[in-house]
């Protein structure tokens, strides 16, 4: 029990997408403030978010400092102006976070088609490679440095004039794809993390067609 | 435990329609890609059609364009097989299986079929 | 679409053979191959993905490889479960296509 007016938070949700991450909660303060901690399993407790009104924390410059590892984190309720009361028990009350594990659980975020050229009847598809905060030797990593092989696109892609959608997948950030000559096509990428058994996919990028800016056509 | 689970088989009139369900357990449909395919009696596997239900993408073989439609009630998760101007050669087990979206996407996991006669 | 042309139709084997499935892509599918085994009135079973992994579960004495455009399926040491039909399957470009099957019976 804490103390008086001072409710524990509850409702304790991560939001991450691409490593970006945020550790969201309940209720909206009324007279308290919250205090966030963060920790790996073996870590010490890192406070973030001192004395905060708000109901979310940026927990994302803790957790890419190593995304394979599994954190916890906790948020404190303290009465608003008397933050150095405790609870009963002498300590702040405080409510855990589910475990969360970056690597098998941030969400894959939208992706976008960079550019794609026509050869002849073949078109070289190419995605986007997202930059994440995921950093190393003080240079911000992209989604596919960070995921590897572990990371694959698949492309939907089908004729202007037709709705069957063809696929092709790859586990570079380009697609070599055989097309009809004279036809134009549209494409849609998805990102997939084959090995995870949740959070698996993206949302479909923006559906880019031939004829249109973002393409290159060259008769051979 | 991931099961996928076909029902609505049974016999039919030439010209005449069914709907397949394909019902899956033990895994979200929208994390994957579901594809029908078929047996005919005493043949081999044939490819009927795909459908990503997280976007409702679809494609589908030749033998059943226009006539087959693959959607999906994420809701449910459940996938379907509406089948209409149904030919004696639709006779077939029909299997709906997952595909786990990798390089080489098998198909790991399988129905246990439902049998559709195409018949007079 | 691409064919895959799957031989022999059917064999003969004992238990405790060596068998050998071999399939044949009409184009580059690189390794975008699976192998099923399917016994009457089942479902297929995966076995090997990717041209050359075992899937899990599966028993070690099934293997597959790769040489170009032809794809192999081994099994080293026939048990008597393995008497089954067993298919190749491709899944580089849509639509995925299925070889023939192979059936292996009991001599």
């Known amino acids: 029990s804490g103390t008086t007016n001072t409710v524990a938070a509850y409702n304790l949700t991560w939001k991450s997408t691409n490593f970006k991450t945020i550790l969201e909660w309940e209720p909206k303060p009324v007279n308290q403030v919250y205090t966030v901690q963060i920790s790996t399993k073996s870590g010490d407790w890192k406070s973030k978010c001192f004395y905060t009104t708000d109901t979310e924390c940026d927990l994302t410059d803790e957790i890419v400092k190593d995304v394979k590892q599994t954190y916890l984190a906790r948020v404190f309720s303290y009465p608003a102006g008397n933050v150095e009361s405790t609870g009963s028990a002498g300590e702040p009350l405080y409510e855990n976070s589910p475990e969360f594990t970056p690597y098998l659980e941030t969400n894959l975020g939208q992706p976008t088609i960079q550019s794609f050229e026509q050869v002849g009847t073949k078109v070289n598809v190419t995605v986007e490679d997202e930059r994440t905060l995921v950093r190393r030797n003080n240079t911000f990593l992209s989604l596919r440095d960070v995921f590897g092989k572990d990371l694959i696109y698949t492309l939907y892609y089908w004729k202007s004039s037709s709705s069957g959608k063809k696929t092709a997948k790859t586990n570079t950030n380009e697609f070599l794809i055989d097309v009809d000559k004279g036809e134009n096509y549209c494409f849609s990428v998805q990102a997939v993390i084959p090995s995870r058994t949740v959070n698996r996919k993206s949302t479909d990028s923006p559906v880019e067609c031939m004829g249109q800016e973002k393409g290159e056509f060259r008769e051979i | 435990e991931v099961q996928l689970v076909e029902s609505g088989g049974g016999l039919v009139q030439p010209g005449g329609s069914l709907r397949l369900s394909c019902a899956a357990s033990?895994?979200?449909?929208?994390?994957?890609?579901i594809h029908w395919v078929r047996q005919a009696p005493g043949k081999g596997l044939e490819w009927v059609g795909y459908i990503d239900p997280s976007n409702g993408y679809t494609y589908y073989a030749d033998s059943v364009k226009g006539r087959f439609t693959i959607s999906a009630d994420t809701s449910k998760n459940t996938a379907y097989l509406q089948m209409n101007s149904l030919r004696a050669e639709d006779t077939a087990v029909y299997y709906c299986?997952?595909?786990?979206?990798?390089?080489?996407?098998?198909?790991?996991?399988w129905g246990q079929g439902t049998l559709v006669t195409v018949s007079s | 679409d691409i064919q895959m042309t799957q031989s022999p139709s059917s064999l003969s084997a004992s238990v405790g053979d060596r068998v050998t499935i071999t399939c044949r892509a009409s184009?580059?599918?690189?390794?975008?191959v699976a192998w099923y085994q399917q016994k009457p009135g089942k479902a297929p079973k995966l076995l090997i993905y990717?041209?050359?992994f075992l899937y899990s579960g599966v028993p070690s004495r099934f293997s597959g490889s790769r040489s170009g455009t032809d794809f192999t399926l081994t099994i080293s040491s026939l048990q008597p479960e393995d008497f089954a039909t067993y298919y190749c399957q491709q899944h580089y470009t849509t639509p995925p296509t299925f070889g023939q099957g192979t059936k292996v019976e009991i001599k």
């Open positions: 184009q580059d599918v690189n390794t975008a």
């Open positions: 299986a997952r595909d786990d979206q990798s390089l080489s996407s098998p198909f790991d996991y």
């Open positions: 033990g895994f979200t449909i929208s994390d994957y890609i």
């Open positions: 990717s041209a050359s």
